[in-house]
Structure formats: structure tokens, C-alpha cells
Interface confidence: medium
């Protein structure tokens, strides 16, 4: 049923207004059931196929073959105590283009997410001869000309304007209905630019001969990757271990990364270097760096970028 | 890998008949309405037939229509070209095409030649 | 018969912009494509619906259509860019039409 009490159509077009106690009044088919019309100066002026010959009473339904500029106002279907209201404005059609701006859909697709347009008019599917699906106004090759269906996953080169555009015949006359999508395709927004957490730059006490694990974390999408660089040649320290990586997924779903860098055996070869750590994703990299000094001289070291 | 294979050209007298055939491979074949395009030698492209998906629509340039039928077989993933009555100006490269629903003519073949000469 | 008429041919130095124009009655109602040939090969896509450039199409290759012409530009227009280009209508639903191809010389 027509739910809605505040409606807009395009003038020209083919229109219906259905109560919502349909199932009701077929159970008391002798109760009088009316359909009122008030605009401006007129006050609930009741319809009847006399009243114009655009429009058509049926026992749940109210129909405009079509509807034009001067249907706008209040309609008003009353039965027994029940009644129901509705306020239709009917906007002129563009006349330069295949639809009218103010009778757009919008909708949001992802890049590389499913979209789909389907062309369906399920009141009147029986007398619709045949259904066009145009985007920008130009007609798409389409096989199904009776509900035209794009399924596929989206490009960015699929936004625009899609029009679904039915035609049918009624009482010997052409009509058309127009149902119009502003399709917008956006980036993946469930990506997230990957970032490292703490500081960026690390200074890191310790003694020689020992052992130390640098522990590198960061937040990042499940494709990104998290790697270590050090020396001139990653590897030729064989004191220097890079651990399995460890992931675990957010509510999110996003992941919680995890890189240990071991060094064993600390010598000076290892102090004063740069060890840098790494996550790369499409959108970019971020690195932050950790340095060894020996316990020693950290007296030297200001307070806020000592890590232990 | 996607990909179209045309073969059955040839050399062919005026009046005379060929059958081309074009082998479709890495997709849904019964999902793309497919098309034949001719080059004529030193020449553009000629759109000579296409034809949809389901093969319940077929379309024709002016200068074959009667004596061309496109044709398309979706188990076999083939799509046929049946040429009679031909003239001198139907030598060309025939290519077959891929013809997607937004408009793309994607995917083409390698071309086979048709010479028609006595 | 419809016809879209194109330039036989269009000449342009290297990292200039050549355009291409394809005219025809109403062209900027129907859907244009532009096919881009090198001798001996088939052709390529290299612009959609206008304007839509297909994946591994470089960015400098750009088109419109409006009223009765559909215009292919080339921007920084490089050596590898010397082909013959042919642009294609959409006439009514499987039927198709093409130019007469242009040829593009890089001096």
C-alpha cells in the first residue's frame, strides 16, 4: 500500500495510490468506501471515474491515467471510522532530459563491490509491453527487454544516471514510468590507511652480549604487509632474527599486526644503526625506526624517547 | 585467459560460399552478445552482424543482409558466420567481437581472410 | 545509412595533444566508442560510453560527445600513439557503425 503521506510524481506518467486496510475492505465489501480530493479552494470534493477521465476507482486503489499538474493537493480515503490521508505534489517533467532531477534515487556503491540495477514495476507488470534501462539518457545493451538487470561488480566508470523506463499501454494510449538512480561509486571505504603504533622514532638501552626483542605492531588492512630493513643487507647478521609475523583480527575487522625483531649477541656493530620497520599498503607506507644504545650512555638520551 | 579464435577464410570464387567459425574461451560465453567486423585491405572497419547472447536476436549491416547469417552455438562456445553468394567486395579480414552490455566491444580475435576472386 | 565522418588523417609532435573528431547527425544521443589500430593487429578498446577509458588504458587518451560531434584527445602524445583510430556508434540496440579511420602521425 501507499504508505507514505507526503508523495511526489512526475507529471505525465501513470499513477496509483493504494490504502493500507485493503485486506479489511474486501471483508466488508458492503461498506461504502470513498476517495476525496481537497486543493485550494475546493474541500473534499469526492471522486469518481466522472470526475475526470484520467482516473480509475478500484476497491483498494486509486488510479491516474496519468497524473498532470493540477492532481496536486490532499487525497483522502475513507471507509467505515477508518481513513487515511495523503498529500501528493506532482512536479513538472524535464522536458530536455529522459528524467527529472527531483525524482532521483541515490545510492552509494563501493568500488569492486556488487551492484545491481533491476528494472521492476510490480503493480503494473501486466501492462507493461516492454522496459528499457538507460544510463545518461542513453539506452544500454540490455538483452531481458522485460526487467532489464545489471549484476556485476562495480567500476568506478559505472556511475551516472540509470534510468529504468517502462512502457505500457492503457486504454489504447502509450504511457510511460520513469524510476531514475544517481549511482555514485566511491573508493573501499572498509580499507584503512595502515599506521604504526608508538613513536616513531625508538631508542632502545641496551648491554653488549645480551639479547633484545624489538617489537614492531601496527593496525592494517588484510592485505598490507609489515617487514623489517636493517644493515646494508637485510640477513648478512647472522645474530639478527626476524620472528613470525602475528595477526589478529579487530571487531573491526581489520587486523592487529605483530613483527619481533631479535638480535642476539649484541655487539657495537649492532649500536647507533637504524632499524627500520615497515608497513605498506596501495595507499602508502608508514616506518618507524628503532636505534640501540648502550645502556652506558642513555644519561645522554632526553627521558620522552627512551624505550625499553 | 580471455580470447577469440577465428578460422574458416579463405579463398573463395564470386558466387561461392564459406562458413567462418570463431572459438571463444576464458568466460561466459552465452552471457556477451558477440559481433563480426570486416577490414577490407588498405580499409576501416566494417560492422557486418552481431548477435545476442541468446542468439534470439540477430542483427545485420545493409550490405549483407540476405545473404549472411550469424549464428551462435552456446554449448560448443562458438559463434559462426555463413556467407553465400559472394562478391569481390566482401574480401576483408573478419574479425569476431565481444560485445559487452555498457557499450564495450573488448575483446577482439586475431582476424581470418577472406579473398573473394576468380 | 547513417554515416560518421572522421579526418583521414591528424598530425602531432610528440607530447602535444592531437584530437580526433567524429561527426554525425545526433551523435551525442547515442553511445561512441574510439578503437585504436596498429598495422598488422586487431583492434583495441581504448575509450567506452563516451568517455569511460577501459583498464591499461593510459591516462592521456580522453573522449566526449555532445550534439553531433564525439572528439578523441590524445594528451602528451607519444611515439607509440602512431596508429589508425576509428570511433564507433551505437545506431539502435546490436546495430553498430564505424568512421573512416583516422590516421595519426607523430612527427
Known amino acids: 500500500c501507499t504508505s507514505r503521506p507526503h508523495i511526489t510524481v512526475v507529471e505525465g506518467e501513470p499513477f496509483y495510490l493504494k490504502h493500507c486496510s485493503c485486506s479489511l475492505a474486501h471483508e466488508i465489501e458492503t461498506t461504502t468506501k470513498s476517495w476525496y480530493k481537497s486543493s485550494g479552494s475546493q474541500e473534499h470534493v469526492e471522486l469518481n471515474p466522472r470526475s475526470s477521465s484520467r482516473i480509475a476507482l478500484h476497491d483498494c486503489v486509486l488510479e491516474f491515467w496519468p497524473v498532470e499538474l493540477n492532481d496536486t493537493g490532499s487525497y483522502f480515503f475513507q471507509m467505515k471510522n477508518y481513513t487515511q490521508k495523503w498529500k501528493l505534489n506532482v512536479i513538472r517533467r524535464n522536458k530536455h532530459s529522459c528524467f527529472t532531477e527531483r525524482q532521483v534515487t541515490s545510492k552509494i556503491v563501493e568500488v569492486k563491490k556488487f551492484f545491481q540495477i533491476t528494472c521492476e514495476n510490480s503493480y503494473y507488470q501486466t501492462l507493461v509491453n516492454s522496459t528499457s534501462l538507460y544510463k545518461n539518457c542513453k539506452k544500454l545493451l540490455l538483452e531481458n527487454n522485460k526487467n532489464p538487470t545489471i549484476k556485476k561488480n562495480a567500476e568506478f566508470e559505472d556511475q551516472g544516471y540509470y534510468s529504468c523506463v517502462h512502457f505500457l499501454h492503457h486504454n489504447g494510449k502509450l504511457f510511460n514510468i520513469t524510476k531514475t538512480f544517481n549511482i555514485t561509486i566511491v573508493e573501499d571505504r572498509s580499507n584503512i590507511v595502515p599506521v604504526l603504533l608508538g613513536p616513531k622514532l625508538n631508542h632502545v638501552a641496551v648491554e653488549l652480549g645480551k639479547n633484545v626483542r624489538l617489537n614492531c605492531s601496527a593496525l592494517l588492512n588484510e592485505e598490507d604487509v609489515i617487514y623489517w630493513m636493517f644493515g646494508e643487507e637485510n640477513g648478512s647478521d647472522p645474530n639478527i632474527h626476524e620472528e613470525k609475523e602475528m595477526r589478529i583480527m579487530t571487531p573491526e575487522g581489520k587486523w592487529h599486526a605483530s613483527k619481533v625483531l631479535r638480535i642476539e649477541n649484541i655487539g657495537e656493530s649492532n649500536l647507533n644503526v637504524l632499524y627500520n620497520c615497515t608497513v605498506a599498503s596501495t595507499g602508502g607506507t608508514d616506518t618507524k625506526s628503532f636505534i640501540l644504545v648502550r645502556k652506558a650512555d642513555m644519561a645522554d638520551i632526553p627521558g620522552h624517547v627512551f624505550t625499553r | 585467459e580471455v580470447q577469440l579464435l577465428e578460422s574458416g577464410g579463405g579463398l573463395v570464387q564470386p558466387g561461392g560460399s564459406l562458413r567462418l567459425s570463431c572459438a571463444a574461451s576464458?568466460?561466459?560465453?552465452?552471457?556477451?552478445?558477440m559481433s563480426w567486423v570486416r577490414q577490407a585491405p588498405g580499409k576501416g572497419l566494417e560492422w557486418v552482424s552481431a548477435?545476442?547472447?541468446?542468439?534470439?536476436?540477430?542483427y545485420y549491416a545493409d550490405s549483407v543482409k540476405g545473404r549472411f547469417t550469424i549464428s551462435r552455438d552456446n554449448s560448443k562456445n562458438t559463434l559462426y558466420l555463413q556467407m553465400n553468394s559472394l562478391r569481390a567486395e566482401d574480401t576483408a579480414v573478419y574479425y569476431c567481437?565481444?560485445?559487452?552490455?555498457?557499450?564495450?566491444?573488448?575483446?577482439w580475435g586475431q582476424g581470418t581472410t577472406v579473398t573473394v576472386s576468380s | 545509412q547513417p554515416v560518421l565522418t572522421q579526418p583521414p588523417s591528424v598530425s602531432v609532435s610528440p607530447g602535444q595533444t592531437a584530437s580526433i573528431t567524429c561527426s554525425g547527425d545526433k551523435l551525442g544521443d547515442k553511445y561512441a566508442s574510439w578503437y585504436q589500430q596498429k598495422p598488422g593487429q586487431s583492434p583495441v578498446l581504448v575509450i567506452y560510453?563516451?568517455?569511460n577509458r577501459p583498464s591499461g588504458i593510459p591516462e592521456r587518451f580522453s573522449g566526449s560527445n555532445s550534439g553531433d560531434t564525439a572528439t578523441l584527445t590524445i594528451s602528451g602524445t607519444q611515439a607509440r600513439d602512431e596508429a589508425d583510430y576509428y570511433c564507433q556508434a551505437w545506431t539502435h540496440s546490436l546495430s553498430t557503425l564505424f568512421g573512416g579511420g583516422t590516421k595519426v602521425t607523430v612527427l
Open positions: 560510453q563516451d568517455s
Open positions: 576464458g568466460f561466459t560465453f552465452s552471457s556477451y552478445a
Open positions: 548477435i545476442s547472447g541468446s542468439g534470439g536476436g540477430t
Open positions: 567481437a565481444r560485445i559487452r552490455g555498457d557499450y564495450r566491444t573488448d575483446i
